[in-house]
């Protein structure tokens, strides 16, 4: 496990709960002390660890960006789960931001898939049925975006 990019805690916390490492590793929700003797609890709502580890620092909780909604909060064992707001989506190519879904398909195409938090609307050619990607130069019909149900954790 390699952890390089962790951000600062916002405030000091009281002494964390401790336990002993098992075979040099600490359980989820903890990090190891620098002398290797103790497992120190992560701080709820501030940092976390998801696996057995020898991290010297717990991982910093993600804060949902504007344009995202928090589906579940950060716990000591799980990062925050954020999802794009209704009418926006996060592409695999650019996961750092939510983009607005298109409101309709180009001429000669029909909508076969709704806007979801992880994908734009899906358009296919009326005749061939082949998919179209990219911005629509013209809109034939207005599509009401509908939010999807699955969520993805923030990266």
């Amino acid at each position: 496990i390699t952890q390089q990019d962790l951000a600062p805690q916002q405030r000091a916390a009281p002494q964390q709960k401790r336990s002993s490492p098992s075979e040099g590793l600490c359980p989820p929700g903890h990090h190891i002390s620098e002398d290797g003797r103790d497992c120190i609890s992560c701080k709820y709502g501030q940092d976390y660890s998801t696996h057995w580890n020898d991290l010297l620092f717990c991982l910093r909780c993600t804060r949902c960006d504007s344009g995202e909604v928090e589906l579940s909060p950060c716990t000591t064992t799980r990062n925050t789960v954020c999802q794009c707001e209704e009418g926006t989506f996060r592409e695999e190519d650019s996961p750092e931001m939510c983009r607005k879904c298109r409101t309709g398909c180009p001429r000669g195409m029909v909508k076969v898939g709704d806007c979801t938090p992880w994908s734009d609307i899906e358009c296919v050619h009326k005749e061939s049925g082949t998919k179209h990607s990219g911005e629509a130069p013209a809109v034939e019909e207005t599509v009401t975006s509908s939010p999807g149900t699955p969520a993805s954790p923030c990266s």
């Epitope: 805690q9 000091a12 040099g24 590793l25 620098e34 290797g36 580890n53």
Partner: antibody, heavy 117, light 108 residues
Framework: EVQLLESGGGLVQPGGSLRLSCAAS????????MSWVRQAPGKGLEWVSA????????YYADSVKGRFTISRDNSKNTLYLQMNSLRAEDTAVYYC??????????WGQGTLVTVSS | EIVLTQSPGTLSLSPGERATLSCRAS???????LAWYQQKPGQAPRLLIY???SRATGIPDRFSGSGSGTDFTLTISRLEPEDFAVYYC?????????FGQGTKVEIK
């Protein structure tokens, strides 16, 4: 008595590589997190990298990320810092230090790395 | 990252006087993760104080540390000739560990 002894420093051209070593004794090396800290001539202290006791977790300063690699051989009680793509601004005395978070309680004598053409 | 700002940059005092060095953090730091070091020319730093107020092994009791949150202080109650040096604070609350820029205590 805890002792940390660095070696491997020297003069290297920009873009070149060096590997620093730190031989540790006087404590249970494999239990402790270790760090490298550097000090440019006439400047203050800058933490460079750290590694957990088992070697499973590593940490780097942004200034060296992707160029430097910290590692350890617990069977030899030795800490390493592999430095690639060296730049003039990497010129410094490099110290091996015991600890990371609660203070560096023991330091080596330092080894000078000079990056110059 | 947490930025530590030390003041003053230089402190000019005479032996026997009291030295008060300040370290201010840009974000709150747990007392457990605040340390102070002394460094003399040509030497490696030496740990003086860890956990904001605990003296390291072999450190004379004229050195003391205090503070919490974002404000920490190193006090040398009566300066001895060997105390003239540069002093650094350091935090390990969150990565990367960072040092203050240092305070030089020089002979007046």
């Amino acid at each position: 008595e805890v002792q940390l002894l660095e070696s491997g420093g020297g003069l290297v051209q920009p873009g070149g590589s060096l590997r620093l070593s730190c031989a540790a004794s006087g404590f249970t090396f494999s239990s402790y997190a270790m760090s490298w800290v550097r000090q440019a001539p006439g400047k203050g202290l800058e933490w460079v990298s750290a590694i957990s006791g088992s070697g499973g977790s590593t940490y780097y300063a942004d200034s060296v990320k992707g160029r430097f690699t910290i590692s350890r051989d617990n069977s030899k009680n030795t800490l390493y810092l592999q430095m690639n793509s060296l730049r003039a601004e990497d010129t410094a005395v490099y110290y091996c230090a015991k600890g990371v978070r609660k203070g560096f309680d023991y330091w080596g004598q330092g080894t000078l790395v000079t990056v110059s053409s | 990252e947490i930025v530590l700002t030390q003041s003053p940059g230089t402190l000019s005092l005479s032996p026997g006087e009291r030295a008060t060095l300040s370290c201010r953090a840009s974000q709150s730091v747990s007392s457990s993760y605040l340390a102070w070091y002394q460094q003399k020319p040509g030497q490696a730093p030496r740990l003086l104080i860890y956990g904001a107020s605990s003296r390291a092994t072999g450190i004379p009791d004229r050195f003391s540390g205090s503070g919490s949150g974002t404000d920490f202080t190193l006090t040398i109650s009566r300066l001895e000739p060997e105390d003239f040096a540069v002093y650094y604070c350091q935090q390990g609350e969150s990565p990367p560990p960072t040092f203050g820029q240092g305070t030089k205590v020089e002979i007046k």
